[in-house]
């Protein structure tokens, strides 16, 4: 377990001709806040699968108002860092997106309250416990500098949050096979639960399951006596044949390398693999420029004659990222409906349908309420060929299984107030607005409308109304 | 984002009926709560019938009973249906939506409906 936290340092206008024009003005005055959304590995993630390693919303940032004629300077930011709390291993590589969203403060007048200004989106390679990685990206005339990190949580070490620590239980060392927990230095690593039958004395684990041998020992469960002669290497894991490990640090302990490096181990020392726009030893220069080729996929490098300027690359069609990096994926719209699979043809989009469903993006449910089950007093509706449960008070969900508060999903617009009734839930609206869910003004250009909440906050934030 | 286009809009004679329909640019309506709004030259726009995400409908009182709303969940569309037209009728007639995922509302650009001998 552990933290993932993102510092925004600064949103503005990038370099290069066409600044963007203020999000804001005196007429209608705004703050910004952020949302970062995280998925595991570095492949796309699957559609429905979206934000799998977790989310996270900003505080709002304060108020601003565009002075007239003035360029649209950095923006003001909110205070303090989003986090994102990992339950399990963090997995070292990640997918991560982050929006810039700005709040509307004057009347609102049809129109949205919530308007999203940006969105950068990248992928990384990370170890827990190394230090601030920093990062610039561009989404148009935009750019979004930050930096992130990703901790493990106590008791939890290394850089998967994988091993756990616990106090020592002697003063001076700890037990067969465990180290030191850096930089916990006077707690020691907890065993982890191993193979079954993997030997408490000779044997020990990093990773639930496994078994791996001190020195001296061999075979699946670290009971077979080796010669010491047999070791080929001074450092490294056991393994049947050699059953060599020397504990203690390895070059790659605490992660060397920068700014999101990549560590691996070579025979004399470490070596790191570094994300582009950084360079050296531990990937702790920066500045890139038109010379280095950083636009990819035919990009187009405009500026950064020296390493102090920035560089901008034009994208061919079909391709977007700061460095012409990504495929533009229209997929990440989630066109595809009931789980179906999407796929980026190029020339077209395709849904590929799970069992069950079918038509251009799988809107069509094939069954019918005939062979349908809602569960807890929910009854079958069709309509359209799809079909769907609706669900008694206080369950929800596809089949009705789940328990649900009618008001947990902020079922009433516009400010309206949820009441749980024994029939059902009821919106009261505020004046000006009609609808089940008053979801209606009666006359929108005159309507002083509460903003709806965005993407991300939970039901009950204090924050979902101004 | 969601885009609304309107159709069905022109003169007809008092008494007479109309369809409007409204093509909504997503995969299901399912996700929209739907109206028709219009504005008269040199009034307010109103309300003049919605209907829900769940199906049930509201209507402005000087159309009860004359005008119905409904939707084809299938085609992703919404229809107005008009009937015994009158002169005080005649307005731009505007699609609305009101999403349920992004929060937001959006608008049609409108169609003209005139009611006139």
């Known amino acids: 377990a552990g933290v993932f936290e993102l510092q925004i340092h600064s949103f503005g206008p990038g370099p290069g001709p066409g600044a963007p024009r203020s999000p804001c003005s005196a007429r209608l005055p705004c703050r910004l806040f952020f949302r970062v959304c995280l998925k595991p590995g570095l492949s796309e993630e699957a559609a429905e699968s979206p934000c799998a390693l977790g989310a996270a919303l900003s505080a709002r940032g304060p108020v601003y108002t565009e002075q007239p004629g003035a360029p649209a300077p950095d923006l003001p930011l909110p205070d303090g860092l989003l986090q994102v709390p990992f339950r399990d291993a963090w997995p070292g590589t990640f997918s991560f997106i982050i929006e810039t969203w700005r709040e509307e403060l004057g009347d609102q007048i049809g129109g949205p309250a919530w308007s999203l200004l940006a969105r950068v989106a990248g992928r990384r390679r990370l170890a827990a416990g190394g230090p601030w990685a920093r990062d610039i990206q561009r989404a148009g005339a935009w750019e979004l500098r930050f930096s992130y990190r990703a901790r493990c949580e106590p008791p939890a070490v290394g850089t998967a949050c994988t091993r756990l620590c616990r106090p020592r239980s002697a003063p001076s060392r700890c037990g067969p096979g465990l180290r030191p927990c850096a930089p916990l230095e006077d707690e020691c690593e907890a065993p982890l639960v191993c193979r079954a039958g993997c030997s408490p004395e000779h044997g020990f684990c990093e990773q639930p399951g496994e078994c791996r041998c001190l020195e001296g020992w061999t075979g699946p469960l670290c009971t077979v006596p080796v010669s010491t002669s047999s070791c080929l290497s001074p450092r490294g894991p056991s393994s049947a044949t050699t059953g060599c490990l020397v504990p203690g640090p390895g070059p790659c302990d605490g992660n060397p390398c920068a700014n999101g490096g990549s560590c691996s181990e070579t025979p004399r020392s470490f070596e790191c693999t570094c994300p582009r726009g950084f360079y050296g030893l531990r990937c702790e220069v920066s500045g890139v420029t038109c010379a280095d080729g950083p636009c990819f996929n035919g990009g187009l490098c405009v500026g950064g004659a020296d390493p102090d300027s920035a560089y901008i690359c034009h994208c061919p069609p079909g391709f977007q990222g700061s460095n012409c990096e990504k495929r533009v994926d229209r997929c990440s719209l989630q066109p595809c409906r009931n789980g179906g699979l999407c796929l980026d043809l190029g020339h077209a989009l395709r849904c590929r349908c799970r069992a069950g469903f079918a038509g251009p993006r799988c809107e069509h449910d094939l069954d019918d309420c005939a062979g349908r089950a809602c569960a807890n007093g929910g009854t079958c509706v069709e309509g359209g060929g799809a079909h769907r449960c609706s669900c008694a008070l206080g369950f929800g969900g596809r089949d009705c299984r789940e328990r649900a508060d009618p008001c947990a999903a902020r079922p009433c617009a516009h400010g309206g107030r949820c009441y749980a009734h024994f029939s059902g839930l009821v919106c009261a609206c505020a004046p000006g607005y009609m609808g089940a869910r008053c979801e209606f003004p009666v006359h929108p250009d005159g309507a002083s409308a509460l903003p709806a909440a965005p993407p991300g906050l939970r039901p009950g934030d204090p924050q979902r109304y101004l | 984002e969601v885009q609304l286009v309107e159709s069905g809009g022109g003169l007809v004679q008092p008494g007479g009926s109309l369809t409007l329909s409204c093509a909504a640019s997503v995969y299901s309506v399912y996700d929209l709560s739907t109206a028709w709004y219009r504005q008269a030259p040199g009034k307010k726009r109103e309300l003049v019938a919605g209907?829900?995400?769940?199906?049930?409908?509201v209507y402005f009182d000087s159309v009860k009973g004359r005008f119905t709303i409904s939707r084809d969940n299938a085609k992703n569309s919404v229809y107005l249906q008009m009937n015994s037209l009158r002169a005080e009728d005649t307005a731009v007639y505007y699609c609305y939506a009101y999403s349920w995922i992004t929060r937001s509302p959006y608008w049609g650009q409108g169609t003209l409906v005139t009611v006139s001998s």
């Open positions: 209907i829900s995400d769940d199906g049930s409908t």
